[in-house]
């Protein structure tokens, strides 16, 4: 649902995301199986969709930012997984400026998918109000698209 970008940029976004490698080659002590990842994605989808739809209703006419790229997939596994450590800082950053209750639920789910001991980068939200709104919209749109992509890949496996 990337209304201002068209399919070509979304394809580029996915390709770039797939290039993202984990900062550590060390396997985590506990990693969830596809069945549990699927459960978490199923929980995240309505939260993400609802957050995006509410934001779009509230902030009509805000364009998507072309400066923000959420590198949300890891390329270390098949099917691709959500790169929780890359996504979490964005949601922590936009939390004070959006629906805290829903974002807390999203953060709680993303934490379960996070690779242990993986560092999170710090994200700063644009100071300009309009740019800030555009930044938030972009995060929410790209996250929704990312969930859709991961869910499709989990479903297209040998299930």
């Amino acid at each position: 649902m990337l209304s201002h970008t068209g399919p070509s940029r979304f394809a580029l976004f996915l390709l770039c995301s797939m290039e993202t490698l984990l900062s550590s080659h060390m396997a985590p002590t506990h990693q969830l199986p596809p069945s549990d990842v699927r459960k978490i994605i199923l929980e995240l989808q309505p939260l993400s969709r609802g957050l995006l739809e509410d934001y779009q209703k509230k902030e009509t006419g805000v364009p998507e930012s072309n400066r923000t790229l959420l590198l949300c997939l890891t390329s270390d596994s098949q099917p691709p997984r959500l790169n929780s450590s890359a996504i979490l800082p964005y949601f922590r950053a936009i939390r004070p400026l959006s629906d805290k209750n829903i974002i807390d639920k999203i953060i709680e789910q993303l934490d379960k998918l996070k690779f242990q001991h993986e560092p999170e980068t710090e994200i700063s939200v644009p100071a300009d109000t309009f740019e800030c709104k555009s930044f938030i919209l972009t995060i929410l749109q790209q996250f929704s698209a990312c969930l859709e992509s991961v869910f499709k890949s989990l479903n297209s496996g040998p299930q």
């Epitope: 396997a27 002590t29 506990h30 199986p33 069945s35 929980e43 496996g157 299930q159």
Partner: antibody, heavy 118, light 111 residues
Amino acid sequence: EVQLQESGPSLVKPSQTLSLTCSVTGDSITSGYWNWIRKFPGNELEYMGYISYSGITYYNPSLKSRFSITRDTSKNQYYLQLNSVTTEDTATYYCARYGNYGYAMDYWGQGTSVTVSS
Amino acid sequence: DIVLTQSPASLAVSLGQRATISCRASESVDTYGNSFMHWYQQKPGQPPKLLIYRASNLESGIPARFSGSGSRTDFTLTINPVEADDIATYYCQQSYEDPWTFGGGTKLEIK
């Protein structure tokens, strides 16, 4: 201690709908995942599906669209509904909890035996 | 779906001896060194009871006579020494992929 208890009819006629209830005590169905499993007369166990703490459901594709799980959080109960039953649905039906990601189904109900026959 | 094949279908063991039950998965059930294979014991008229989770972890309250091992596609449940109370059917179950599946069961009897 967590306890689950299945209830419902022991005899159902072919083509009718089977409805079962799982009553949970000692835990809230608004946390974890709540499952249905059945055991056929030949001892084969089949995983049927779950309803999650938020009400999201998953159904085993083998059951096609005959099967649904609902819940009533105020009663701390969840329900199985299986439409258009045949004699092949004769089984013992269990409800079970999946409490933690990466774990297993740790608490089970005693099971309720259901026969489909005219 | 992942198919779990248990062997043998039935097993007769003398009291005090070792019982070994095998479970083979049609594909790997491992993720990052964790095997999402579990073992249950079921006695007549009772529900399945969790014995071992994630291939080798003993569920609390289960005697240390029970142990699990294996990875990827090949798993083993060992009972050593077997006691009279262990007469039951044992099932493996994978939670790696949806839909979750069970093995066909192994019936343990005493010689």
